[in-house]
Interface confidence: low
Amino acid sequence: IQVMSQLSGRRVLVTGFPASLRLSEEELLDKLEIFFGKTRNGGGDVDVRELLPGSVMLGFARDGVAQRLCQIGQFTVPLGGQQVPLRVSPYVNGEIQ
């Protein structure tokens, strides 16, 4: 078994969600898309989003957005009435061969 991993140039992994967060899947994804969709937050147009265990993957329509967000690395995002500190890191595509 070989695990092939590849950095995705247009995707990021958002982590750090507290267990106390009271949002539905759709609400969480919508709020993250709105926040990271804003250029003033370093983001850009989101064209794919996926809820993963304890994290969210966001994909952007243009090159450079994911890299910029990963360079900043730390964001405090309004979610469910809280100011939630989140981390943004490169998204790694993995597949088992």
Epitope: R40, R68, G73, Q74, T76, P78, Q83, P85, L86, R87
Partner: antibody, heavy 117, light 107 residues
Framework: VQLVESGPELKKPGETVKISCKAS????????MNWVKQAPGKGLKWMGW????????TFADDFKGRFAFSLETSASTAYLQINNLKNEDTATYFC???????????WGQGTSVTVSS | DIVMTQSPAIMSASPGEKVTMTCSAS?????MHWYQQKSGTSPKRWIY???KLASGVPARFSGSGSGTSYSLTISSMEAEDAATYYC??????????FGAGTKLEIK
Amino acid sequence: VQLVESGPELKKPGETVKISCKASGYTFTNYGMNWVKQAPGKGLKWMGWINTYTGEPTFADDFKGRFAFSLETSASTAYLQINNLKNEDTATYFCARYGYSWAMDYWGQGTSVTVSS
Amino acid sequence: DIVMTQSPAIMSASPGEKVTMTCSASSSVSYMHWYQQKSGTSPKRWIYDTSKLASGVPARFSGSGSGTSYSLTISSMEAEDAATYYCQQWSSNPPITFGAGTKLEIK
């Protein structure tokens, strides 16, 4: 949330000073830390910030060269080091946490550094 | 670099008077914040994201603006409001610059 800075320093020109900023009441690596200079009777001047998760520092143009930011993550502490001190480094230095919308939501009490021969 | 110009540099107001101070940016900014600092103490976040009041800030304070022009207003001046107020912008490069401050005194 509390940011507690180290005590006042009296130094001679050419010496080095290292100021600490100990954070408590939150997860240290979830928020970046800024450093801000205030010379006597003057306004606030942003020096830069350090990403407390990656350790990557970012410096304002006027603070590139003699200045260093560092972390001791296990102790939830950020440090500012100034090398080859000059008289114009005499100031109060504040650490301040990056918060919502990139505002500085919590500040240390400030550390006074006096450089005099 | 984005330059922040605060005006006036110094102003005084009588109790009950309405106070407005302004902050002008040399180019459009992403976020604007205001801090209050009293002599011998560290600054406090006062208004963030243009118009949101920080916890504990009296409702007589308000913030407004967009693009390059922003203001802080006190609807009815009180003695405890005497302080220096700094505006601060965040944009992508460099992330932060402060205005020179407006010193507000009580008459």
